[in-house]
Interface confidence: low
């Protein structure tokens, strides 16, 4: 009588998560009579995966009809593979009995599961910061296997180097997660900037996954204020303008004060963007100098994005009118600006009220 051999031809099989796996097993003899069982792992803690004779295993089917006469193919098909299915699978022949007795095991087939990382999710800081400050962005991706993975950060296409990355867990697991934190120094030109987290993994066939975040969500560009007097109009009216330039986001409230009393409050809305993503706004106030006996102190007060108000004041010299056109009038700044750079060449958009 020929001694029975259990042949598992593949030492290893690699399958993508969600796909099906076929584990091959043939025996060389019909003797002894008895069932085939498949186990994951070896030893007393092995896990029963498939039993030819009894029990039911919903995700496992026999490749051939094991009940047909002279069948010696006991290969199985496992559907909907997950990383939890990874391990070494053994095809084991039993001799019919009460209970059945193990006769011989195949050499085992190692099933490795390739699971794609989830789409990277990039999150930015909870509060906005101004230029020259450093903000942190976090990128997370989950559920991948094997553990080897590459993560890169880019800002406007340029690779960043200031970041820290962790892959968890450190030990062996059915799947892994990656978390990386990048530090980005903001510049005043970053309203249109983007940070990109790029994840490369063996399951992605060279086509990395990307997650993005817009720096517009993280940056605040404070406004620059300039108050000027336009040429004298008829009827003893002086036109004073407040130019609020290069600010982001658009959330801005402007208040005119005459001698400390609120004259008018306006909210910025639907402003056109500058090329760099910032906004400009011009507001003007007509002052009837004939209604004033003394000089008028005008203050343009701007509250931007919930920050402390910035003031720019201007004195209209009543004594200088109507003969003088205002070229000798003095402007004074009674507040502080959050920026010290000069206005550049972006065109100002004037909104007359």
């Amino acid at each position: 009588e020929e001694e029975l051999q259990v042949i598992q031809p593949e030492k290893s099989v690699s399958v993508a998560a969600g796909d099906s796996a076929t584990l091959n097993c043939t025996v060389t003899s019909l003797i002894p009579v008895g069932p085939i069982q498949w186990f994951r792992g070896a030893g007393p803690g092995r896990e029963l995966i498939y039993h030819q004779k009894e029990g039911h295993f919903p995700r496992v089917t026999s490749v051939s009809e094991s009940t047909k006469r002279n069948n010696m193919d006991f290969s199985i098909h496992i559907s909907n593979i997950t990383p939890a299915d990874a391990g070494t699978y053994y095809c084991v022949k039993f001799r019919k009995g009460s209970p059945d007795v193990e006769v011989k095991s195949g050499a085992g087939t190692e099933l490795s599961v390739r699971a794609k990382p989830s789409a990277p999710v990039v999150s930015g800081p909870a509060v906005r910061a101004t230029a020259e400050h450093t903000v942190s962005f976090t990128c997370e991706s989950h559920g991948f296997s094997p553990r080897d993975i590459t993560l890169k950060w880019f800002k406007n296409g340029n690779e960043l180097s200031d970041f820290q990355t962790n892959v968890d867990p450190a030990g062996k697991s059915v799947s892994y997660s990656i978390r990386s934190t990048a530090r980005v120094v903001l510049t005043r030109r970053d309203v249109h900037s983007q940070v990109i987290c790029e994840v490369a993994h063996v399951t992605l066939q060279g086509d990395p996954l990307r997650g993005t975040a817009n720096l517009s969500e993280a940056i605040r560009v404070p406004p620059f204020l300039e108050v000027t007097q336009q040429s004298m109009r008829a009827d003893n009216q002086v036109n004073v303008t407040c130019q609020v330039t290069k600010f982001y986001p658009q959330r801005l409230q402007l208040t005119w004060l005459e001698n400390g009393n609120v004259s008018r409050t306006e909210m910025a809305s639907a402003l056109p963007e500058n090329k760099d993503g910032t906004y400009n706004w011009t507001s003007w106030l007509l002052v009837n100098v004939s209604a004033h006996r003394d000089d008028v102190k005008l203050t343009c007060q701007v509250e931007h994005d919930g920050q402390p108000a910035v003031n720019k004041s201007f004195s209209v010299k009543v004594s200088a009118h109507p003969k003088e056109q205002g070229s000798n009038t003095a402007a004074e700044n009674t507040g502080t600006n959050e920026r010290d750079y000069k206005d550049d060449d972006d065109k100002h958009h004037h909104h007359h009220h």
Partner: antibody
Framework: QVQLVQSGAEVKKPGASVKVSCKAS????????INWVRQAPGQGLEWIAM????????HYNQIFKDRATLTTDTSTSTAYMELRSLRSDDTAVYYC????????????WGRGTLVTVSS | DIVLTQSPDSLAVSLGERATINCRAS??????????LFWYQQKPGQPPKLLIY???NRDSGVPDRFSGSGSGTDFTLTISSLQAEDVAVYYC????????FGQGTKLEIK
């Protein structure tokens, strides 16, 4: 979490049929066997049959083979047990139970459906 | 068919004492290294609850005072220290072939 919600109590006349439903949630319905077990008042448990929702493979207790029919509707994750030619001794609580470990055991049970057969 | 016979039919045990229920199969329920024997607890007005699977493995959430033992044809469910909430009817079930249940053992407090 796994839940099996059964249809309400039924009163039937001898010779009639009854169809009890069992709606499953909290797991992949097609991956696990559903068993049906009954318990007459003050009596023990009696296994009726089992069904694999993925392919409708069924195994019946020989006692019920000619009178019971198990079916499933995978679109609603619902299992059904129909019992025909009812007799007074079919009066019982009918349970559905899910075999989570694929061991022909009953890990999760419905609350039961009382079927009363009386003329 | 494999017939399961439980003994005793009823049992009264003092609180804190050990309770032992036996289940004998008409032929072996052991196969492929496992004993295909399960224990259930049923309290009045409730569905049964799985306690022990494959003869000796506690189901999740089952207190460790419950244990199962045995192989082949003879099996035992032991409650090491009876608590008031353990009053119930206990059933064994096999799945060596198509399932059958034992007739049940009613456990009461002495």
């Amino acid at each position: 979490q796994v839940q099996l919600v059964q249809s309400g109590a039924e009163v039937k006349k001898p010779g009639a049929s009854v169809k009890v439903s069992c709606k499953a949630s909290g797991y992949t319905f097609t991956n696990y066997w559903i068993n049906w077990v009954r318990q007459a008042p003050g009596q023990g448990l009696e296994w009726i049959a089992m069904i694999d929702p993925s392919d409708s493979e069924t195994h019946y207790n020989q006692i019920f083979k000619d009178r019971a029919t198990l079916t499933t509707d995978t679109s609603t994750s619902t299992a059904y047990m129909e019992l025909r030619s009812l007799r007074s001794d079919d009066t019982a609580v009918y349970y559905c139970a899910m075999d989570y470990g694929s061991l022909y055991a009953m890990d999760y049970w419905g609350r039961g459906t009382l079927v009363t057969v009386s003329s | 068919d494999i017939v399961l016979t439980q003994s005793p039919d009823s049992l009264a045990v003092s609180l804190g004492e050990r309770a032992t229920i036996n289940c004998r199969a008409s032929k072996s329920v052991g196969s492929s290294g496992y004993n295909w024997l399960f224990w259930y607890q049923q309290k009045p007005g409730q569905p049964p609850k799985l306690l022990i699977y494959l003869a000796s493995n506690r189901d999740s959430g089952v207190p460790d005072r419950f244990s199962g033992s045995g192989s082949g044809t003879d099996f035992t469910l032991t409650i090491s220290s009876l608590q008031a909430e353990d009053v119930a009817v206990y059933y064994c079930q096999h799945s060596r072939e198509l399932p059958t249940f034992g007739q049940g053992t009613k456990l009461e407090i002495k």
